[in-house]
């Protein structure tokens, strides 16, 4: 499919001008290559009319130009003094006319309306309101006032001052007669429809002395704004319909076949299932404007979108609307990253978030998508050191590996953590991405004690058991704080006896705190990583208390306080049932979502046969 995109249809009137914008992926080659506008012939060729290399056909001499905007990835063709001869099928494209890097554009130039003398022209957008003013003379002040619409050869009564309203206008038209001082009546038509367009005649009086005034009403269907976004990226539709609909339900819909427009999201709580987890309708301002953000763009999201206002929360005739034509560029600069990450209760996930590498200094954020009402995304963590209170000790945002990717680690997982999460920055808004965390059956891979109590002034040793599957990984201990997790020295104590069917490659790695102080209290993580790519983590809360008896403490899995729903096993390890435990300090064991091989190697994205890409999952 060609990545070039432009308007499918352009409509204008003789004597007017048009401006046609064509979009292309702004790669270095594309920015500098030839741009052209050509007219398609009956036999399939395409005759160049104008190009970025200076060529202008004699047909366009003095009335057209082509301007390239390489920084935006667009070029614009302006054509003036249009005639009906300009109607036809065109292409805007890059490179050679026949190469296929182009987009088909249909240009329709119509004859201007043949208007009667003294005709007032009203040009109004679909769904809006028009006021047709009708002057009259004093002698007709007391006489019947009426408005007719010319249908073919015959005028059809629309409204009159005796109370008649044509059924096509019921509930949306009124006739106002100004105060006695003003010799004027006006007809106000709301929620304009395309079918309202045409020639109208106002009349005061019914005899040969009646006053008449011609009006031509043009109802404009909104030209769609062209939106060109990358696959896997994000789009924001800003919808400003005006203060008159501030209190009316709003919607965004996507046009399907014919005139159907399927609701994508509305303010009445409806949301299309295909957009679950990746759409937000942001609250409207007093002026009735609102915006809709969609992330994780897919090929099938391309199409025409309309936003509007109607009490039903969906498109109806006469809804004021705004339109966009969304093109999803498959030659995306946004790298593939897993859209689904799996974890087990008590375990952990490490989520990779892409961002625009040109914006390494931008602030990174991670938020939890909430679908209630219009949807919102409460922040959980940011790269400036803010962590939501309920996530302290179990959530960290790391700038690693850098160069266009940051990492978010969430541990002590419970079923309540399942859901959609968004990665975003305060920079390029197109790089918002969505990941779904799923909680699956299984046991955490790393084994640590539950909550541990250290004694002031003594030494504390905390074990972390790594199964043999992590033999090639770097193992670490760190102390959590709201800006990250500061690495601490740890000792490899040799093979672990914590795993059945696990050979000498399993490891017991201990954290030692010498001469414990109050400052040592807090959350500690043990984990695995490969280079700057993080795998599973397990968390332990270390409390510090006054000295009771001398000595050092060497914590084994069995010695740590047993939490509710735990059984101390003969082997000296605790088994935690997969239940949501309110106090995060009560989690003893940890398990990462994905097989860390998937997370820690270069690719990390294992794509399943469905459309979603999944990260990891060895312990299914």
């Amino acid at each position: 499919k060609s990545p070039i995109f432009g308007p499918e249809e352009v409509n204008s009137v003789e004597g007017n001008s048009v401006s046609i914008t064509c979009y292309y992926p702004p790669t270095s080659v594309n920015r500098h290559t030839r741009k052209y506008w050509c007219r398609q012939g009956a036999r399939g060729g395409c005759i160049t009319l104008i190009s970025s290399e200076g060529y202008v056909s004699s047909k366009y001499a003095g009335r057209a130009n082509l301007t390239n905007f390489p920084e935006n990835g667009t070029f614009v063709v302006n054509i003036a003094q249009l005639s009906q001869d300009d109607s036809g099928r065109y292409k805007c494209g890059l490179g050679i006319n026949s190469r296929g890097l182009s987009f088909d554009v249909s240009l329709e130039v119509s004859q201007g309306p043949g208007l009667l003398n003294d005709t007032k022209v009203y040009t109004v957008d679909l769904g809006r309101t028009v006021t047709i003013n009708c002057p009259f003379k004093t002698e007709n002040a007391q006489k019947r006032k009426s408005l007719y619409k010319q249908i073919g050869l015959y005028p059809v009564l629309v409204i009159d001052s005796s109370g008649y309203v044509n059924p096509n206008y019921t509930g949306r038209i009124r006739l106002d007669i100004q105060g006695t001082g003003q010799l004027l009546f006006s007809v106000v038509i709301n929620q304009l429809r395309l079918s309202d367009a045409g020639q109208y005649l106002c009349q005061a009086g019914d005899d040969s002395n009646s006053n008449k005034k011609n009006a031509d009403l043009q109802v404009l269907k909104p030209e769609p704004e062209l939106v060109y976004e990358d696959l896997r990226g994000s789009v924001t539709f800003h919808c400003a319909l005006g203060p008159e609909v501030a209190n009316v339900a709003k919607f965004l819909c996507r046009q399907s076949s014919g005139e159907n427009c399927d609701v994508v999201v509305n303010t009445l709580g409806k949301r299309a299932p295909a957009f679950e987890g990746r759409i937000l309708l942001n609250p409207q301002d007093k002026d009735g404007s609102f915006s809709v953000v969609i992330t994780g763009l897919r090929k099938e999201d391309a199409g025409r979108y309309l936003c509007g206002a109607h009490s039903d929360g969906q498109l109806q005739e006469g809804s004021p609307i705004q339109a966009w034509q969304l093109f999803v560029n498959e030659e995306s600069t946004i790298p593939r990253s897993p859209t689904v990450v799996k974890g087990v209760a008590g375990g952990s996930v490490a989520v990779l978030c892409p961002y625009n590498r040109k914006e390494s200094k931008s602030i990174k954020y991670w938020c939890l998508w909430e679908g209630a009402q219009n949807g919102r995304c409460p922040l959980l963590v940011d790269s400036e050191g803010w962590v939501k209170a309920q996530y302290e000790g179990r959530l960290s945002l790391l700038e690693e590996p850098g160069n266009g990717t940051f990492t978010v680690i969430l541990n002590q997982l419970t079923s309540r953590d399942a859901g959609f999460y968004w990665c975003l920055t305060n920079g390029d808004t197109l790089w918002r991405t969505t990941v779904e965390i799923k909680i699956i059956e299984g046991e955490p891979n790393l084994k640590v004690p539950g909550n541990v109590t250290a004694v002031l002034g003594e030494t504390l040793k905390v074990p972390c058991h790594f199964p043999c599957k992590f033999s090639s990984y770097e193992k670490y201990w760190c102390k959590w704080n709201n800006t990250g997790c500061q690495a601490l020295p740890s000792q490899d104590e040799g093979p672990s006896k914590a795993f059945v069917n696990c050979d000498e490659n399993s490891r017991l790695v201990s954290l030692t705190l010498n001469l414990v102080t109050r400052a040592d209290e807090g959350w500690y993580w043990c984990g695995v990583k490969q280079g700057h790519f993080y795998g599973e983590t397990a968390a332990v809360y270390v409390a510090v208390e006054e000295r009771k008896a001398a000595g050092s403490r060497d914590v084994s899995l069995a010695k740590a306080d047993a939490a509710p729903d735990e059984k101390v096993l003969d082997s000296g390890f605790r088994e935690i049932e997969n239940k949501a435990i309110q106090d995060p300090r009560l989690f003893a064991e940890e398990k990462a979502v994905a097989d860390t091989r998937d997370q820690a190697d270069g690719s990390r994205a294992s794509v399943d046969s469905g459309s979603s890409e999944e990260q990891g999952g060895s312990s299914r």
Epitope: L280, Y365, C377, E384, A389
Partner: nanobody, 127 residues
Framework: QVQLVESGGGLVQAGGSLRLSCAAN????????VGWFRQAPGKEREFVAH????????AYADSVKGRFTISRDDAKNTVYLQMDSLKPEDTAVYYC????????????????????WGQGTQVTVSS
């Protein structure tokens, strides 16, 4: 429960200065932002300035830019609003507010983004 207490308001002549303080009792360690808002009689509450607790980034309403400065003192759990070159149209009750549950797409210039509010302090600028 977070309690916010504003102080420092009063009567001042046009062109003068005031420094408002917003002290938090029981501030959550995870306060995201603190904002100052004001409300003149018969008018809606309007945004004045806000400061991000981490990183210290600030934003101001156009009407006060260059005249007002927002700052914070972590140790004292206090946010300040230094108001210079005061004008009669700055007369209002000034409120401080704290956001501990920010939305990724929220606008910190909107009062609805903030959970905790102080009682307000009156600032009157005479001409």
């Amino acid at each position: 429960q977070v309690q916010l207490v504003e102080s420092g308001g009063g009567l001042v002549q046009a062109g003068g200065s005031l420094r408002l303080s917003c002290a938090a009792n029981g501030r959550a360690a995870n306060a995201y932002a603190v904002g100052w808002f004001r409300q003149a009689p018969g008018k809606e509450r309007e945004f004045v300035a806000h400061i991000r607790w981490n990183g210290g980034r600030t934003a101001y309403a156009d009407s006060v830019k260059g005249r007002f400065t927002i700052s914070r003192d972590d140790a004292k759990n206090t946010v300040y609003l230094q108001m210079d070159s005061l004008k009669p149209e700055d007369t209002a009750v000034y409120y401080c507010a704290e956001d501990t549950n920010p939305d990724a797409f929220g606008d910190l210039r909107l009062p609805s983004e903030y959970e905790y509010w102080g009682q307000g302090t009156q600032v009157t600028v005479s001409s």
